[in-house]
Interface confidence: low
């Protein structure tokens, strides 16, 4: 049979399941974890659970041949193969390939740099989230969207402040920081403002190299 | 129509076991699962266990484990569960009971039940 | 093993009345959950299946509700024969199994 493609949100409830009707009056059915390892079985009417870390956590619909797997987590990562057994006494198989994907945790924004520059101000930000892998893309005053975690720009003299939107995503997910940026360009850190979580919907966090020196965060 | 005719009153003393028989009639037995349930005098129900009379193969409530046998003849069409080692408390209402076709353990058609009474 | 509870053990109507028994779960059984009736001397009798569908032969009077933990058994309108002892049954597939509530006396008040 052919192979699916499914990826998901981790704590999130997955239906697994093949786009066309089962084989009519099929005789068994199985669900199977990575090609070997029993999950349930349908037989004369009666499905059977096994012993598995899916115990509990799992449901056959018998009609379709769906799988509902509760609470999915990263281990849950597998290809997945339903066997039908038809009445002809021939199988068929399918296959799910399951990605469980965490969702991206909320970024953290440091300031890597902030100098005037023949009078104009050379900002670097970084955007900071731990071991994943995802897209970045920056939002605000930018010449051009920024796709990656390090945000360089420089400003002219201006009497408002910027802001700046570091977006992480992967597939199932996207979190938002923003830093808020006020002249002068070598303000004391105070007057660098969070967007804080009412304003945005979302706790952001932010950063700066002086910050990391004395284990403070704002 | 689909009919479970059950064995008469059984008196018993304690330690001793008794044979509840179950006939069907009115549809095919071997698609069929046939469970046991009792209800002892003034209680509710209690389920023992099932027989696949297609296979043979059986279940029974942890309660009953070791001292519950079921089995069937499918040229009589009839389902049989044997307790043995009856303790007084065993005095009951037991039930023969058909499946709802493929719902796995709704039970629509049951027999008229079978007193087993257990005194010395 | 799955405890179900059944509420309140015995319900005082009259004929025409509304009655609306309970069954409550000790852990999610989704829909998988019966009701049946079981009149002095007889067998008991499906009512509902799957927490929801009627079973055949019965009337529209009944009809069931409720999924995860918590269920419902209503009779519409009661008619004299509606007086009896209701049970929920849950089923379990692994381990294989079987529960039924402690009951519910309906009694004509």
């Known amino acids: 049979g052919r192979l699916v493609h499914m990826t998901v949100v981790s704590g999130s409830n997955v239906t697994l399941n093949i786009s066309e009707s089962l084989p009519e009056n099929y005789k068994q059915l199985t669900w199977f974890y990575t090609f070997d390892q029993k999950i349930v079985e349908w037989d004369s009417g009666k499905s059977k659970y096994f012993e598995s870390k899916f115990k509990g956590r799992v449901r056959l619909d018998p009609q379709s041949g769906a799988l509902y797997i509760s609470k999915v987590q990263k281990e849950d990562n597998s290809t997945y193969v339903m066997r039908v057994l038809k009445k002809d006494g021939y199988e068929q198989e399918w296959k799910i390939k399951l990605q469980v994907l965490d969702p991206v945790p909320k970024p953290v924004i440091k300031i890597e740099k902030r100098e005037d520059v023949d009078d104009n101000c050379y900002l670097k930000l970084s955007c900071v989230i731990p071991g994943e892998s995802v897209n970045y893309t920056w939002y605000g005053e930018l010449p051009k969207e920024i796709q990656n975690s390090v945000l360089e720009t420089t400003l002219k003299p201006h009497k408002h402040s910027r802001c700046y939107t570091c977006q992480v995503s992967n597939s199932v997910s996207s979190k938002n920081g923003t830093f808020c940026f006020s002249p002068p360009c070598t303000a004391a850190r105070s007057e660098q403002k969070l967007i804080s979580e009412e304003d945005l919907g979302g706790e952001q966090k932010l950063i700066s190299e002086e910050d990391l020196h004395h284990h403070h965060h704002h | 129509q689909v009919q479970l005719v059950q064995s008469g009153a059984e008196a018993r003393e304690p330690g001793a076991s008794v044979r509840v028989s179950c006939k069907a009639s009115g549809y095919t037995f071997t698609d069929y699962f046939i469970h046991w349930v009792r209800q002892a005098p003034g209680q509710g129900l209690e389920w023992m266990g099932w027989?696949?009379?297609?296979?043979?193969?059986?279940n029974f409530a942890q309660k009953f484990q070791g001292r519950v046998t079921m089995t069937r003849d499918t040229s009589l069409i009839t389902a049989y569960m044997d307790l043995s080692r009856l303790k007084s408390d065993d005095a009951a209402v037991f039930y023969c009971a058909r499946d709802v076709d493929g719902s796995g353990w709704y039970l629509d058609f049951w027999g008229q039940g079978t007193l087993v009474t257990v005194s010395s | 093993e799955i405890v179900l509870t059944q509420s309140p053990a015995t319900l005082s109507l009259s004929p025409g009345e509304r009655a609306t028994l309970s069954c409550r779960a000790s852990?999610?059984?989704?829909?998988?959950l019966a009701w049946y009736q079981q009149k002095p001397g007889q067998a008991p009798r499906l009512l509902i299946y799957d927490a929801s569908n009627r079973a055949t032969g019965i009337p529209a009077r009944f009809s069931g509700s409720g999924s995860g933990t918590d269920f419902t058994l209503t009779i519409s309108r009661l008619e004299p024969e509606d007086f009896a002892v209701y049970y929920c049954?849950?089923?379990?597939?692994?381990?294989?199994?079987?529960?039924f509530g402690q009951g519910t006396r309906l009694e004509i008040k």
């Open positions: 049954q849950q089923r379990s597939d692994w381990p294989p199994s079987i529960t």
């Open positions: 027989i696949n009379p297609n296979s043979g193969a059986t």
């Open positions: 852990q999610s059984v989704s829909i998988y």
